[in-house]
């Protein structure tokens, strides 16, 4: 005959309050000839859970009916489970005995732990944006989980990402935790479109992790390249000059013409493009009179991209004779 | 094969003893507690007593108590009762039954039984 | 001790006929009640255990119903190898007690 072996599958199981919970429990062999009993803790305090001979256990049913004859199956369902329930759940075989039965072999137990899924997590950017090849910070928070073991993961892009420092809180005991992480994360041009991604697993998720996302198109500052150019043709007596503000974010711009150091007001054709890498470009058109101009006309185009210093270009403007010539036919 | 194979018939004068044996075979004998069961003549069932064949271990009805002894010897897989101080309401069919039932007592395997009689 | 009280004492019936037997503890058992069948110089048989489980090898015309201190033996279609004595046993606690018997008996 087999020895007898308890056999308690599970090391930890997490339940949540107000649900119910099975408790597992099999058996190798039905000799010696004796009761099954379930109980909470060791020694002499330990609490009866379960006798299917006497007793009350109302919120205690079996899984199968220990009425049978061979049945080797001992598992319960505790129902409406609340914070009083936790603890380490043994079933024990008796041999029967007398004047009372003898304990014969518990299982290794099974401890019931109350587990608390984490909240979806929260990732947060820095408040200001910083230009390319700067580092920021982000961070990942999640709460409301338990037990204490948690795994965080941060990924760029999907590329995991290994600068960065985690907290669970509290370290002792308690009802519930608490995680927060700050990764730091270098800036590079093309990330505009780029994501954060903090990703939390914890054994209440079972194999599913939560997911934070933050986009660093919030965190990023691209600063603009300027070019002016004079247009070689001219339409009539006016001469294009185009400033083409190239790889810029945010869209947040303001462009100003100056003509010799004077505000030009007037309006200017322009157009907006986005880049494939979600930077933008701005293209603005001035057209100079160039009737009556002195050789010494210098454009600026000034740019003021959110909210940073101004940056400009000048162009000085080259007006040959001949042009002048024509314009003057060209005038009345 | 699963069997309670008992010993024979015997007659007893009052105040005698008897030994009756119950051999088990075909079950692992450790395993399973034995009763004792007997049966006067044209009379119901009434339980003598139990033994654990695991640890020998005993609970005799309160009426035999003191006259009364069961015994196993695991070696050899055998279950004894003996019977002190025979009164001729001792006369009875004797059974040896095993007991099966893991939280309670239910008797699924039963030798033939062997009758006693007191007689002067 | 738990008196166990069967009845009837006796029951004469024909073969095809539905038997009750009864049987009553004096104190709540729970479902540990055995019933059994013994034929005239041979060993007693285990029917039904645990109230309404059915031994091994036994015919499904036996079954067993009752928990607390109310327990009932039906015999739904009376075969002639069925007339016999049958006791109810409790199997609660020390000391294990049988019921007097009920004698089925051919009409």
């Known amino acids: 005959e087999e020895e007898l072996q308890m056999i308690q599958p599970e090391k930890l199981l997490l339940v949540t309050v107000g649900k119910t919970a099975t408790l597992h429990c099999t058996v190798t062999s039905l000799l010696p000839v004796g009761p099954v009993l379930w109980f909470r803790g060791v020694g002499p305090g330990r609490e009866l859970i379960y006798n299917q001979k006497e007793g009350h256990f109302p919120r205690v049913t079996t899984v199968s009916d220990l009425t049978k004859r061979n049945n080797m199956d001992f598992s319960i369902r505790i129902s409406s489970i609340t914070p009083a329930d936790v603890g380490t759940y043994y079933c024990v075989k008796f041999r029967k005995g007398s004047p009372e039965n003898v304990e014969f072999k518990s299982g290794p137990g099974t401890e019931m732990a109350l587990g608390a899924k984490p909240s979806a997590p929260v990732v947060l950017g820095p408040a200001a944006r910083t230009t390319p090849e700067h580092t920021v910070s982000f961070t990942c928070e999640s709460h409301g989980f338990s037990p204490r073991d948690i795994t965080l993961k941060w990924f760029k892009n999907g590329n995991e990402l290994s600068d960065f420092q985690t907290n669970v809180d509290p370290t002792g005991q308690s009802v519930a935790y608490s995680i927060r992480s700050t990764a730091r994360v270098v800036l590079d041009p093309w990330d505009v479109r780029s994501q954060v991604i903090c990703e939390v697993a914890h054994v209440t998720l079972q194999g599913d992790p939560l997911r934070g996302t933050a986009n660093l198109s919030e965190a990023i500052r691209v600063p603009p390249t300027l070019e002016v150019t004079q247009q070689p043709m001219r339409v009539g007596n006016q001469v294009n000059v185009t400033c083409q503000v190239r790889k810029f974010y945010p869209q947040s711009l303001q462009l100003t013409w100056s003509e010799n150091g004077n505000v030009c007001q007037r309006e200017t054709a322009s157009t907006l493009t986005e880049n494939k890498d979600g930077t933008y470009n701005w293209t603005s058109w001035f057209l100079v009179n160039i009737s009556d101009q002195r050789d010494d006309v210098v454009l600026t185009c000034q740019v003021k991209h959110d909210g940073q210093l101004a940056v400009s270009k000048r162009l000085a403007l080259e007006v040959t004779v001949h042009q002048k010539d024509q314009s003057s036919d060209a005038t009345p | 094969q699963v069997q309670l194979v008992q010993s024979g018939a015997e007659v007893k004068k009052p105040g005698a003893s008897v030994k009756v044996s119950c051999k088990a075979s075909?079950?692992?004998?450790?395993?399973?507690?034995i009763v004792w069961v007997r049966q006067a003549p044209g009379q119901g069932l009434e339980w003598m007593g139990w033994?654990?064949?695991?640890?020998?271990?005993?609970n005799y009805a309160q009426k035999l108590q003191g006259r009364v002894t069961m015994t196993t010897d695991t070696s050899t897989s055998t279950a004894y009762m003996e019977l002190r101080s025979l009164r001729s309401d001792d006369t009875a069919v004797y059974y040896c039954?095993?007991?099966?039932?893991?939280?309670?007592?239910?008797?699924?395997?039963w030798g033939r039984g062997t009758l006693v009689t007191v007689s002067s | 001790d738990i008196q166990m009280t069967q009845s009837p004492s006796s029951v004469s019936a024909s073969v095809g006929d539905r038997v009750t037997i009864t049987c009553r503890a004096s104190?709540?058992?729970?479902?540990?009640l055995a019933w059994y069948q013994q034929k005239p110089g041979k060993a007693p048989k285990l029917l039904i255990y645990?109230?309404?489980n059915l031994q091994s090898g036994v015919p499904s015309r036996f079954s067993g119903s009752g928990s607390g201190t109310d327990f009932t033996l039906t015999i739904s279609s009376l075969q002639p190898e069925d007339f016999a004595t049958y006791y109810c046993?409790?199997?609660?606690?020390?000391?294990?007690?049988f019921g007097g018997g009920t004698k089925v008996e051919i009409k």
């Open positions: 039954a095993r007991e099966a039932g893991s939280s309670w007592y239910d008797f699924d395997l």
């Open positions: 075909g079950y692992t004998f450790t395993g399973y507690g």
């Open positions: 033994i654990s064949a695991y640890a020998g271990e005993t």
């Open positions: 104190q709540g058992i729970s479902s540990w």
């Open positions: 645990a109230a309404s």
């Open positions: 046993q409790q199997g609660a606690s020390f000391p294990i007690t």
